[in-house]
């Protein structure tokens, strides 16, 4: 997992039954916030499953790993982590499962060392385009973020404000061109129907991209050409029917890539011929022997690697759910 972890060092706690005599004094710079557990040795603060409604103001300056999971934060305002002096050491921030539905512009400003951010399992109905860049300048100061984990952040359908969720997320990834140093991006389980074109070209440092468990039907307008550092591409559990020649050539041209394609409803008709030929020759697809046809009915469960051109003819009728361009 790419969530921040810490050693099981001794944690001090500010739970009432562990309160020390100094708790009645004015807060000290490195005191542990109420309802949190702190380990200065591990540079870790955990405020987990405490139903917090806002980020504690009195976070210790030493914190490198901050867990704020399982809370009820609702809104992350601008400068939510801005402190005097700043939290200069904070490198890993986990906000997963904290019922966030709005992340405002500049929410993560004044965190100069923030390398890993996990916002997974929050119903983000309103993610500002400038949530990660902090400003609406054409070119913002580069973000220090290297890993951005955004799995299962799609809100319920009735909270999506009648707009494209894909577009909202991509705007936040691209605005200010601040995330050019991003190496890991996880966008699994977000009901993405499509990937906006050119988005990957604007994240040139990506090593790991996880788009698994979405509803992607096609990669026709997605270019992987510039992602020369890409090492893993997870496309499992989508709605992919076939990969066309342009996509196959781009993937083959990436020097370090491993692609994961399991559990897609591959349509084994005449359009699949190029992909089958490619699969037989390529080394980039992991578990390629597990890929099977879903349609047409007569081809169901046939292994793609075992098909030949005679098997791949075109019957015009597809099930309605797959009749998309």
């Amino acid at each position: 997992s790419s969530s921040p972890t810490s050693s099981a060092s001794s944690f001090s706690s500010s739970a009432p039954f562990l309160a020390s005599a100094v708790s009645a004094q004015p807060p000290l710079p490195d005191q542990c916030p109420a309802l949190c557990e702190c380990s200065e040795a591990a540079r870790t603060v955990k405020c987990v499953n405490r139903n917090l409604t806002e980020v504690p103001t009195d976070l210790p300056a030493y914190v490198r790993n901050l867990f704020l999971t399982g809370n009820q934060l609702a809104v992350l305002p601008a400068g939510a982590f801005a402190r005097r002096p700043p939290l200069a050491e904070l490198a890993a921030l986990n906000l997963s499962g904290s019922r966030l539905d709005e992340v405002r512009a500049g929410a993560f400003e004044h965190l100069p060392s923030l390398r890993q951010l996990d916002l997974s399992h929050n119903p983000l109905a309103d993610l500002s385009p400038f949530a990660f860049s902090g400003s609406n300048a054409s070119v913002s100061a580069p973000s220090p973020l290297v890993e951005l984990i955004l799995n299962h952040i799609v809100p319920p359908e009735d909270e999506r404000q009648n707009r494209s969720f894909e577009g909202m997320v991509v705007a936040a990834l691209l605005a200010g061109r601040a995330l050019q140093g991003l190496r890991r991006l996880e966008l699994a389980s977000n009901h993405f129907l499509y990937l906006p074109r050119d988005v990957l070209a604007q994240l040139p440092s990506l090593r790991h991209l996880d788009l698994s468990n979405n509803s992607l039907v096609s990669l026709t307008y997605v270019s992987f050409r510039n992602l020369t550092h890409l090492e893993s591409l997870h496309l499992e559990d989508n709605a992919l029917k076939v990969l066309h020649n342009g996509t196959l050539a781009e993937l083959q041209g990436l020097p370090h890539i491993r692609v994961f394609l399991d559990n897609n409803p591959w349509v084994c008709d005449c359009h699949m011929a190029d992909m089958v030929t490619w699969l037989k020759e390529t080394e980039v697809v992991q578990g390629k022997d597990r890929l099977t046809c879903a349609y047409p009915e007569k081809m169901r469960n046939r292994v793609l690697l075992e098909l030949n051109s005679a098997d791949l003819d075109c019957d015009p009728i597809l099930p309605p759910s797959l009749q998309t361009s």
């Epitope: 691209l174 499509y194 074109r197 050119d198 070209a201 604007q202 510039n226």
Partner: antibody, heavy 123, light 107 residues
Framework: EVQLQQSGPELVKPGASVKISCKAS????????MNWVKQSHGKSLEWIGD????????TNNQKFKGKATLTVDKSSSTAYIELRSLTSEDSAVYFC????????????????WGQGTTLTVSS | DIQMTQSPASLSASVGETVTITCRAS??????LAWYQQKQGKSPQLLVY???SLTEGVPSRFSGSRSGTQFSLKINSLQPEDFGSYYC?????????FGGGTKLEIK
Amino acid sequence: EVQLQQSGPELVKPGASVKISCKASGYTFTDYYMNWVKQSHGKSLEWIGDINPYSGGATNNQKFKGKATLTVDKSSSTAYIELRSLTSEDSAVYFCARGSIYYDSTANYFDYWGQGTTLTVSS
Amino acid sequence: DIQMTQSPASLSASVGETVTITCRASENIYSYLAWYQQKQGKSPQLLVYNAKSLTEGVPSRFSGSRSGTQFSLKINSLQPEDFGSYYCQHHYVTPWTFGGGTKLEIK
């Protein structure tokens, strides 16, 4: 004031190629996608493709793959479309049009247009 | 590709009348629809985007609306300068496609 100034009309022979230019002014050229749109005589509009001037990354409508190549010259804030293997079907007015700001993948409407370049393919 | 079906193809009306042009998308495009006006020999001009947001400088007699996958452009109290062709265009996912157009003529 935003302006898109296109090159003049072209008369070319079948099989030839042509390159049409679109010079942008009045805004930060690299911040907005530049689109190209075809309008055949008396017909509707067809989106050919767009290009991100910052990265040079182009997206073509599949229908125009192999027909149109989109490029930019950032130093002169100019976008180009090259059309090759021309036939009479390519005779049309070609427009450049400013599209979305680079980070907004859903604002793909065209708020400023060039005046259009008439291409006639005839022997 | 998403198909945009525009109707009517042509329409005659008098100055002062109210007209409505409709456009239907072949699938859900949320509110990602734009309307353009084009005069003979000129470039199209953006009137409406996001289904109902009016471009700056466009008169308030123009209005856009959405009901599911059907979109409408309404022009109240037609003025002489409103005559020309109108096109819808979805701006949801590539390739962006246009409706076939509606030619609005003076009766």
